[in-house]
């Protein structure tokens, strides 16, 4: 058993049918001695009395807020929670496994620069008595301090007869060099609880693998006279790291048909403009990748050809 | 400790290609390895990652680009003097800093350069001959080396007479070229920022 | 105690279909995952599928995908897999078992794909 | 479609040691514990072993496990004519748990 935050107990259960569970000993937080009772949630039946209480913690029913009482008087509080361990893995059963980049994926990172700041969010189809609490560091030996906000509901979808929440978080290396060469991750622990089920998930990555740039902007058109090509020029994403000259970008520049089935055109470059052929009904996109470590595509930013 | 904005002539940077060739080499070289020796602890994930030239030289510092000298915790302390006769750019305006900067590079191929011969010598002699450094990758490392073009002390190649440990060296074949993959990005920043300013 | 008793085996036509029951007893059923394996006359044990004590996951083998379903009612303490499209390879003894570090097997159910 | 290897069989004279190896990789033995199940003939698999070397209550002490690595193994010291069965290793892979993973299994053979 161990305390996640002041009166909140984790109690870690080996969970399998007919599991001994783990035996838990509660003390009242008083200077009484005497006349103690204690009850569990709301129920007012007496499980015990003096100033400990041993349970036996098998199951969610043993779970819960336990309370000590004197003469009709709450006295304190300690809520029990359980953290499952099933065949030797920590459950997984808040958490939507995301399956991308790979399986067992429950939290997901990007960043939009070098500059320390980064986003992670995870799904969930639990809509009701949830709680997460985020930390994260630079390394896990000798932590280096990176500060997170809280988590938020940030989006909600519906999946087959499913809804799907997702929530997410924003977090800043506290002291960031962009130019830093990094040889220790950046650890994210998310503490999930829900009702009396507490989980924890974690994610280890470098900014270098998680930056995934805005779309470029100003995306234009300049027809070429007496010509079906056209001048394509856009801008770094305000977002980017300066300067743009050591941080530098790289393009993908995209036609593509009304239909999907159409052949879609490509170039790659590292200026801020190309040269293309226009077609009827097209549409013209460009994408943008860090031009030295290739990490994720930018989404597209698009503009029709008409 | 960072780059001044120099303006050299057009098309005199010759370094620039040589990086850029550098880092597809390594990219190239990192991804064979990986494929090879999938059954080694050989990804990012899994590796410890270690910096051969870490307390040797500074080039992250040395290069840092103007505009993030502001931010101080790109201000590392280390203080390293290099040998300032380089002649990437061939204009007279090549400051200390930029000598400095391009200098510890210099130390920085030559570092990795004893490393990967070292450790090419080590791989032949395994009987299983897995997998083995690109000739390629040598051959540019050596082309950078050249256009960068420092006096300085040839560093023996390390010679050992124990019995290789093959898994050992493999899985340093993988900590070395994911280290020096990182590094290759940063020269490779380097050499446009200067090849734009 | 805990007591796993399976039934619904039998002799089936390749391409036909059958449903094998787990019925759970001595536990809270509802609590836990659970997993079917396979056994061919004479061969391994092979896992097939995995069930979230709730339902709302379900994993099954490449071999079975999309022709097996594992299902559960926790209202009724049972465990079902359901077999369509039934191959000769699929002849086995079957189990139903459950997940934890402890776990408890049924007696097996043979089913046996034959025309 | 087995990772986890095991020899076909293995024998003994009774009161002898017999090991049984099972080999897999660093995304399943390597990162995941390994379980041990006898399974005598005509009956369910009944577990010997969990979490790598631990042993549930009535299994018999001569009944031992053990990892390292990528590799577990299974001992029995004193071999005994009742131990003569199949024997299986199994444990996870970190991409597609909780699917198990079953070694190829070993004919335990007591001679004489």
């Known amino acids: 058993i161990w305390e996640l935050k002041k009166d909140v107990y984790v109690v870690e259960l080996d969970w399998y049918p007919d599991a001994p569970g783990e035996m838990v000993v509660l003390t009242c937080d008083t200077p009484e001695e005497d006349g103690i009772t204690w009850t569990l949630d709301q129920s007012s039946e007496v499980l015990g009395s003096g100033k400990t209480l041993t349970i036996q913690v098998k199951e969610f029913g043993d779970a819960g807020q336990y309370t000590c009482h004197k003469g009709g008087e709450v006295l304190s509080h300690s809520l029990l929670l359980l953290h499952k361990k099933e065949d030797g893995i920590w459950s997984t059963d808040i958490l939507k496994d995301q399956k991308e980049p790979k399986n067992k994926t429950f939290l997901r990172c990007e960043a939009k620069n070098y500059s320390g700041r980064f986003t992670c969010w995870w799904l969930t189809t639990i809509s009701t008595d949830l709680t997460f609490s985020v930390k994260s560091s630079r390394g896990s030996s000798d932590p280096q301090g990176v500060t997170c906000g809280a988590a938020t509901l940030s989006a909600e979808r519906v999946r087959g007869d499913n809804k799907e929440y997702e929530y997410s978080v924003e977090c800043q290396e506290d002291s960031a060099c962009p130019a830093a060469e990094e040889s220790l991750p950046i650890e994210v622990m998310v503490d999930a609880v829900h009702k009396l089920k507490y989980e924890n998930y974690t994610s280890s990555f470098f900014i270098r693998d998680i930056i995934k740039p805005d779309p470029p902007k100003n995306l234009q058109l300049k027809p070429l006279k007496n010509s079906r090509q056209v001048e394509v020029s856009w801008e770094y994403p305000d977002t980017w790291s300066t300067p743009h000259s050591y941080f530098s970008l790289t393009f993908c520049v995209q036609v593509q048909g009304k239909s999907k089935r159409e052949k879609k055109d490509r170039v790659f470059t590292d200026k801020t403009s190309a040269t293309v052929i226009c077609r009827k009904n097209a549409s013209i996109s460009v994408r943008a990748q860090d031009r030295y470590y290739s990490s994720s595509w930018s989404e597209w930013a698009s503009v029709p050809c008409s | 400790r960072n780059l001044p904005v120099a303006t050299p002539d057009p098309g005199m940077f010759p370094c620039l290609h040589h990086s850029q060739n550098l880092l597809r080499a390594v990219s190239n070289m990192l991804q064979k390895a990986r494929q090879t020796l999938e059954f080694y602890p050989c990804t990012s994930e899994e590796i410890d990652h270690e910096d051969i030239t870490k307390d040797k030289t500074s080039t992250v510092e040395a290069c840092l680009p103007l505009e993030l000298t502001k931010n101080e915790s790109c201000l590392n302390s280390r203080e390293t003097s290099f040998i300032t006769n380089g002649s990437c750019l061939a204009s007279r305006k090549t400051s200390f800093m930029m000598a400095l900067c391009l200098s510890s590079i210099y130390e920085d191929l030559k570092m990795y350069q004893v490393e990967f011969k070292t450790m090419n010598a080590k791989l032949l002699m395994d009987p299983k001959r897995q997998i083995f450094l690109d000739q390629n990758m040598l051959a540019v490392i050596d082309e950078l080396m050249q256009a960068l073009n420092f006096n300085s002390e040839t560093v023996p190649q390390k010679s050992s007479l124990e019995e290789p440990d093959f898994y050992k060296t493999k899985i340093k074949l993988c900590i070395l070229l994911h280290a020096f993959r990182i590094r290759a990005v940063t020269i490779d920043r380097v050499m446009s920022y200067l090849n734009a300013s | 105690q805990v007591q796993l008793v399976q039934s619904g085996g039998g002799v089936v036509q390749p391409g036909r279909s059958l449903r094998l029951s787990c019925a759970a007893s001595?536990?809270?059923?509802?609590?836990?995952?659970m997993h079917w394996v396979r056994q061919a006359p004479g061969k391994g044990l092979e896992w097939v599928a995995f069930?979230?004590?709730?339902?709302?996951?379900?994993y099954y083998a490449d071999s079975v995908k999309g022709r097996f379903t594992i299902s559960r009612d926790n209202s009724k303490n049972t465990l079902y897999l359901q077999m369509k499209s039934l191959r000769a390879e699929d002849t086995a003894v079957y189990y139903c078992?459950?997940?934890?570090?402890?776990?408890?097997w049924g007696q097996g159910t043979m089913v046996t794909v034959s025309s | 479609s087995y990772v986890l290897t095991q020899p076909p069989s293995v024998s003994g004279t009774p009161g002898q040691r017999v090991t049984i190896s099972c080999s897999g990789g660093?995304?399943?033995?390597?990162?995941?514990?390994v379980k041990w199940y006898q399974q005598l003939p005509g009956t369910a698999p009944k577990l010997l072993i969990y979490?790598?070397?631990q042993r549930p209550s009535g299994v018999p002490d001569r009944f031992s496990g053990s990892k390292s690595g990528t590799s577990a193994s299974l001992a029995i010291t004193g071999v005994q004519a009742e131990d003569e069965a199949d024997y299986y290793c199994?444990?996870?892979?970190?991409?597609?748990?909780?699917?198990?993973?079953f070694g190829t299994g070993t004919k335990v053979t007591v001679l004489g």
């Open positions: 069930i979230r004590y709730d339902g709302s996951n379900k």
């Open positions: 660093r995304s399943n033995i390597g990162s995941n514990t």
């Open positions: 001595g536990f809270t059923f509802s609590s836990y995952g």
């Open positions: 199994q444990s996870y892979d970190r991409g597609t748990h909780p699917a198990l993973l």
């Open positions: 979490q790598n070397d």
């Open positions: 078992k459950t997940h934890g570090s402890h776990d408890n």
